[in-house]
């Protein structure tokens, strides 16, 4: 028996369902009584889900997994993972045994989009050209780690005097805070872009300083 999985990682958004595809080519006359199917975590060998002795043995992994029982006889051994969490990320191995045995591993890459950045300014009043200001760009609940890029109103990258920090919250999602210290010109726009490298998603925030009032 030959097991086939997708070579590319499966990208799944947090809190959505993901399908880890695995297939085999059943011989003529194949019956499910002959099938032993095991899904396990590749690194730790922890059992995730199994089908043995002609029946679905159920989820051994936080009761969030399911097979496609009607499709098994056609050679579809895919695994459905419900309500994906950050901790589900990793490699999963699909083992299929009929008369002989084969296995293959598929990677699950978890992702979550970053929120639209919120921009804060300190100080936020009595601003004059030549003043040093601190602009903070904050974006929340993304995964995996973000990249943050600052630009001025002409699109020129601002790389000096930038301090970025990232922190994983209780769900493993990241909150990112990036601080730009800049000397004000007569007026100007400062933009922050928070990039999720897996989703190729950019979240934008900007602040325009034109005397008073400020525009966010």
């Amino acid at each position: 028996v030959e097991v086939q999985v997708s070579e590319d990682p499966v990208v799944a958004l947090v809190d959505t369902d993901a399908t880890l595809r695995c297939s085999f080519s059943p011989e003529p006359g194949f019956s499910l009584a002959q099938l032993n199917l095991i899904w396990q975590l590749t690194d730790t060998k922890q059992l995730v889900h199994s089908f043995t002795e002609g029946r679905d043995q159920g989820s051994a992994y936080s009761n969030r997994t399911a097979l496609f029982p009607d499709l098994l006889v056609q050679g579809n051994a895919s695994l459905r993972l419900q309500r994906v969490r950050v901790t589900d990320e990793g490699s999963y191995t699909c083992f299929v045994s009929i008369q002989d045995f084969d296995s293959a591993a598929v990677s699950l890459q978890v992702a979550a989009p970053y929120s639209k950045p919120s921009m804060t300014l300190e100080p936020n009043k009595d601003l004059r050209p030549g003043n040093m200001v601190t602009i903070t760009c904050s974006s929340y609940q993304g995964y995996p780690e973000a990249e943050v890029f600052w630009k001025d109103g002409q699109g020129v990258p601002l790389t000096g005097n930038v301090t970025t920090s990232q922190m994983a919250n209780e769900r493993g999602l990241f909150d990112v805070h990036s601080v730009l210290r800049v000397v004000l010109g007569a007026n100007g726009t400062y933009s922050c872009l928070v990039r999720n490298p897996v989703l190729q998603q950019d979240a934008h925030g900007s602040v325009t300083i034109t005397g008073q009032p400020l525009t966010f």
Partner: antibody, heavy 122, light 108 residues
């Protein structure tokens, strides 16, 4: 084979400069965050700097080197750099480059170079 | 900055004995902790990530546990090649990534 190879270490006077390089092979370099970690003689490990995946990506520094060291990467050459200026005696250490365990993440390092020694002394 | 405190500084044990190493964080870091082994003249080697997951190729005698602020690395039965210095490292809140001061496991 996944490999990191540092070079560029040596003896330099206080106030001097050095540029360390770390050549990567055997993996998709442009998908991995990279780090520099150092170890002073007889001391523990100290994180020095890290850089995100993009060309010209985000750079992060320990307070002890901020303003003096600059990390960069050239994804077309699969190479990580550490430009060290205004070197001090306390920068004397073995410098390691490290690759994160998983692409797109900055957490733990499962691939390390052999280290290159930097000695700052007059 | 999150500070990691490792204890004891030195652990003197005989081959075959069980080693228990501790790492305490100055604030909660969930399970965002790694353990490394380092032998003289060599680069560090990743043992454990996510507080309890063994890295590729690491023998089953190494196990990690804990979450929040208290973490433990256990070597169930010390082999001669396990005598080394062990470091913990957090990646919950950065920069900086921070390492503990290390625990030296030496032959008694």
């Amino acid at each position: 084979e996944v490999q990191l190879l540092e070079s560029g270490g040596g003896l330099v006077q206080p106030g001097g400069s050095l540029r360390l390089s770390c050549a990567a092979s055997g993996f998709n370099f442009s998908s991995y965050w990279m780090s520099w970690v150092r170890q002073a003689p007889g001391k523990g490990l100290e994180w020095v700097s890290g850089i995100s995946i993009s060309y010209g990506g985000n750079a992060y520094y320990a307070d002890s080197v901020k303003g003096r060291f600059t990390v960069s990467r050239d994804n077309s050459k699969n190479t990580l750099y550490l430009q060290m200026n205004s070197l001090r005696a306390e920068d004397t250490a073995v410098y390691y480059c490290g690759r994160d365990r998983s692409p797109y993440q900055y957490r733990s390092m499962d691939v390390w170079g052999q280290g290159t020694t930097v000695t700052v002394s007059s | 900055e999150i500070v990691l405190t490792q204890s004891p500084g030195t652990l003197s044990l005989s081959p075959g004995e069980r080693a228990t190493l501790s790492c305490r964080a100055s604030q909660s870091i969930r399970s965002d902790l790694a353990w490394y082994q380092q032998k003289p003249g060599q680069a560090p080697r990743l043992l454990i990530y996510g507080a309890s997951s063994r890295a590729t190729g690491i023998p089953a005698r190494f196990s990690g546990s804990g979450s929040g602020t208290e973490f433990t690395l256990t070597i169930s039965s010390l082999q001669s090649e396990d005598f080394a210095v062990y470091y913990c490292q957090q990646y919950n809140n950065w920069p900086p990534l921070t390492f503990g001061g290390g625990t030296k496991v030496e032959i008694k």
